[in-house]
Structure formats: structure tokens, C-alpha cells
Interface confidence: low
């Protein structure tokens, strides 16, 4: 389907897209979810822990699962990013297609905080993120190969 009026990413709720790598415009890192729950960025697209599954829970709202880690990206109440074994309310993000064709992922529970990576490859605290920052811009790339 076409992009919905609100500019959010449109794909059928409950359906999985193909696995993706989320490439961050800030430093060129791929979002990585480790089996121990740590979250960071890495430049090597061959790293198995950058393969992510995005699932729509409703229009424009996704959960982000690390395929190898079998964990879900979560934004904690103090702004930390980690990956949990179970889906919780902290695992839902508003996915939006920005005018520059990059995506942003904003926490549904903590609605002014975004998923973001620093230029060092570390994640950025949600409390330090905001619209317009390069750190919050991600380009979904196919990870089928």
C-alpha cells in the first residue's frame, strides 16, 4: 500500500517484512542487537547481529527484533536502549518516513525519545535525542543475503 497520510511506514499489521539492516546516517553504523541484550552499532554489514525483523503491531508502530539474538529492542524509562527477551510496551516504536527518505523510530511509551546511534557506534540516550538529529535517521536495507 501507499504511504499513509501521516507519513508513517505502511505495511500490513502483524506481517513481517523481509529481514532488514538499519543503517544509521550518523557515522554509517548498522544497528546491532547482541544476545546478551546490549545494543550498539557496527560498520560491518556481515555481522550476524545486525539482521533485524520489523513487525508492525498497528499502522506505523513496529517492534524490532534481533534475529540472531532473539531479543526485542526496548527503550527504558531512563533513556537506555537494550534488548529484552519478551515484548513489552517499551518495545513499540513509531516508524516514520522522513522527507529525506530516512526512517525514524520514536518510542511509543516515551514519546519524545528516539532510537539513535552516536558517531562512535554507541547508542545515544533517548533523553538526549530529538527531531533533526542525524543520529536518529536510519535507512532500512535488505538483509536477506
Amino acid at each position: 500500500p501507499a504511504l499513509p497520510e501521516d507519513g508513517g511506514a505502511a505495511f500490513p499489521p502483524g506481517h513481517f517484512k523481509d529481514p532488514k539492516r538499519l543503517y544509521c546516517k550518523n557515522g554509517g553504523f548498522f544497528l546491532r542487537i547482541h544476545p546478551d541484550g546490549r545494543v550498539d552499532g557496527v560498520r560491518e554489514k556481515s555481522d550476524p547481529h545486525v539482521k533485524l525483523q520489523l513487525q508492525a503491531e498497528e499502522r506505523g508502530v513496529v517492534s524490532i527484533k534481533g534475529v540472531c539474538a532473539n531479543r526485542y529492542l526496548a527503550m527504558k524509562e531512563d533513556g537506555r536502549l537494550l534488548a529484552s527477551k519478551c515484548v513489552t510496551e517499551e518495545c513499540f516504536f513509531f516508524e516514520r518516513l522522513e522527507s529525506n527518505n530516512y526512517n525514524t523510530y520514536r518510542s511509543r511509551k516515551y514519546s519524545s525519545w528516539y532510537v539513535a546511534l552516536k558517531r562512535t557506534g554507541q547508542y545515544k540516550l533517548g533523553s538526549k535525542t530529538g527531531p533533526g538529529q542525524k543520529a536518529i535517521l536510519f535507512l532500512p536495507m535488505s538483509a536477506k543475503s
Epitope: G14, E57, E58, R59, V61, T88
Partner: nanobody, 130 residues
């Protein structure tokens, strides 16, 4: 044990209407469907297709429709009855399928990080034929 039970399917002529219902029972907290509900369908020999969805929020939430049903199908819900609906008008032969409802629900709403689960119904057959 949370269960979703669909009803309202059956045989209808092209151009006719049906209203599917998806009733939830056995909820631990009475909040089933408030996180969002969807209708999917599976035609014979085909894959699962998302037909319509309604988002989170006690007062309704955003709706999603597949292009093939826009303007003909309407999704709604009644939280007081814990029921999800799909009103299907101007039915066509290609709408013939088993229709499934699915819902997200909170298992433990008192926790700061609420556990969320997805449930599926058993399906109801809709046949559009003259």
C-alpha cells in the same frame, strides 16, 4: 485462557453484505483489543493477507485497510463488549476466504513494562457466490 471467537461468516451473493464479529473471552484484565486488532484472510491456495486493522487507544485508534477493500470494508470495535467487527459491503467473488481476527492484549497492566501478547481466532469462512 484468552480466546477469540469469530462469527458472521457464510454464503452471500456478489454485491451483498456481511458483518463479522470477533468476541474475546477469558481476558485477565478486560483490556483485550485496546492495544489493537486486525482482520486477516486466507483465500484457497493463497497466503495470509492483512485486510483491516485498528490501532491502540480506548477511543478508537487509527485504521488500516488493504487497497483491495478500501471503501467497502469497515473495521470497528466495542471495548465494552470486547468485540472486534468487520463490516463487509459490496462483496465480490475474490473476497471468498477464511477470515481470521487477531488482537493484542495486555497480560499484566499493573506492571510498568506491560507484557503484550497476540491472539488469533479460529477463522470463519466467507463465500461470495451466485
Amino acid at each position: 485462557q484468552v480466546q477469540l471467537v469469530e462469527s458472521g461468516g457464510g454464503l452471500v451473493q456478489p454485491g451483498g453484505s456481511l458483518r463479522l464479529s470477533c468476541a474475546a473471552s477469558g481476558t485477565e484484565d478486560g483490556r483485550l483489543l485496546t492495544l489493537g486488532g486486525s482482520w486477516f484472510r486466507q483465500a484457497p491456495g493463497q497466503g495470509l493477507e492483512a485486510v483491516a486493522a485498528i490501532g491502540a487507544g480506548d477511543r478508537g485508534g487509527a485504521t488500516y485497510y488493504a487497497d483491495s477493500v478500501k471503501g467497502r470494508f469497515t473495521i470497528s470495535r466495542d471495548n465494552s463488549k470486547n468485540t472486534l467487527y468487520l463490516q463487509m459491503n459490496s462483496l465480490r467473488a475474490e473476497d471468498t476466504a477464511v477470515y481470521y481476527c487477531t488482537a493484542l492484549y495486555e497480560r499484566q497492566p499493573q506492571l510498568a513494562a506491560t507484557k503484550v501478547a497476540r491472539k488469533w481466532g479460529q477463522g470463519t469462512l466467507v463465500t461470495v457466490s451466485s
